[in-house]
């Protein structure tokens, strides 16, 4: 015996209070599949969320984050504050990477510069808060009299970040 509700298409629900007839979803609700016994409440994009796609009777609203924030989680379920490159987000706000660390993204945390000497190489280009060092040939490979930039490079171990 076929379930009488199975004939109710997306955008409607099977109304038990009205002899299982198909009723349209009320405002601010939707049903994305057929045969639903109730419509789901539309997601509301509030606060740091903004509407990317309006809710319709057959599909939920979609949100993204307002400028200055980035999405995390399935369907952009969370928004986290952006920082600038060369910074990381702490509870006290965006803080510059401390010396010897860098962040080349607007999100995430600072990580230590590569220690070129661990690979037997020398520093070709110094690191900054926004960029890792660039390692070059090993000091032994350099021709006599050639020089390379060799500032004291911290080992690639996590340092203390400003907090």
């Amino acid at each position: 015996l076929q379930d009488p509700c199975s004939k109710c298409p997306a955008g409607t629900f099977c109304d038990n209070n009205r002899n299982q007839i198909c009723s349209p979803c009320p405002p601010n609700s939707f049903s994305s599949t057929s045969g639903q016994k109730a419509c789901d409440i539309c997601r509301q994009c509030k606060g740091v969320f903004r509407t990317r796609k309006e809710c319709s009777s057959t599909s939920n609203a979609e949100c993204d984050c307002t400028p200055g924030f980035h999405c995390l989680g399935a369907g952009c379920s969370m928004c986290e504050q952006d920082c600038k490159q060369g910074q990381e987000l702490t509870k006290k706000g965006c803080k510059d990477c401390c010396f010897g660390t860098f962040n080349d993204q607007k999100r995430g945390i600072c990580r230590p510069w590569t220690n070129c000497s661990l690979d037997g190489k020398s520093v070709l280009v110094n690191g900054t808060k926004e960029r890792d060092v660039v390692c070059g040939p090993s000091p032994a490979d350099l021709s006599p009299g050639a020089s390379s930039v060799t500032p004291p490079a911290p080992a690639r171990e996590p340092g203390h970040s400003p907090q």
Epitope: L72, G73, S77, E88, K91, G108, R111
Partner: antibody, heavy 116, light 108 residues
């Protein structure tokens, strides 16, 4: 959509080596941290360490430093957790998760059983 | 490293308010996050950055964090909230994440 898919369950003997994997898809794998989390049977979550796949920078919880190795191959969007010599006490569910502070996506877990 | 301490278990009657604490030295200086884990499943974020609720998480979940204690509050607890709950924090000293020991919430 974003997914982290872990390798299947493993049954090993003490002293054996093991490498389990976590393959990311649906996002820029290189630019998000991947963490590994252990859950021993009937116990809580323990953060083991993390890796930044873009340059394979790792750091470990002091409790796991020297006990395991975390690595990644960004060309195939995969992170790894490995042991050189397993112990019975390594029996646990191991999860990979995206992030360093807020873990917004999790793998389904890999159950590792170590028994003689 | 900071240590986070949670009560092993909390019991609450349906419809009542459950409060789960997470204590650690100056945890209020860091963001606290809360995860819900049901048997056989991976954890899910229910509160992030002290008090923010991901979309899809019911409004009855809320969080606070100051001093030495972060708190997860579930108002009007429902049977489906029965699960293990874990607090966590990321500490910039040592670059490490720490989880609390977990709290088993039982809805009577």
């Amino acid at each position: 959509q974003v997914q982290l898919v872990q390798s299947g369950a493993e049954v090993k003997k003490p002293g054996e080596s093991l490498k389990i994997s976590c393959k990311g898809s649906g996002y820029s794998f290189s630019t998000y941290w991947i963490s590994w989390v252990r859950q021993m049977p009937g116990k809580g979550l323990e953060w083991m360490g993390k890796i930044y796949p873009g340059d394979s920078y790792t750091n470990y919880s002091p409790s796991f430093q020297g006990q395991v190795t975390i690595s990644a191959d960004k060309s195939i969007s995969t992170a790894y957790l490995q042991w050189s010599s397993l112990k019975a006490s390594d029996t646990a569910m191991y999860y990979c998760a995206r992030g360093y502070g807020i873990f917004d996506y999790w793998g389904q877990g890999t159950l590792v059983t170590v028994s003689s | 490293d900071i240590e986070l301490t949670q009560p092993p278990s909390v019991s609450v009657a349906p419809g009542q308010t459950a409060r789960i604490s997470c204590s650690g030295d100056n945890i209020g200086d860091q963001y606290a996050h809360w995860y819900q884990q049901k048997p056989g499943q991976a954890p899910v974020v229910v509160i992030y950055q002290d008090k923010n609720r991901p979309s899809g998480i019911p409004e009855r979940f809320s969080g606070s964090n100051s001093g030495n204690t972060a708190t997860l509050t579930i108002s009007g607890t429902q049977a489906e909230d029965e699960a293990d709950y874990y607090c966590s924090t990321y500490t910039f000293v040592g670059f490490t994440t720490v989880f609390g020991g977990g709290t088993k919430l039982t809805v009577l």
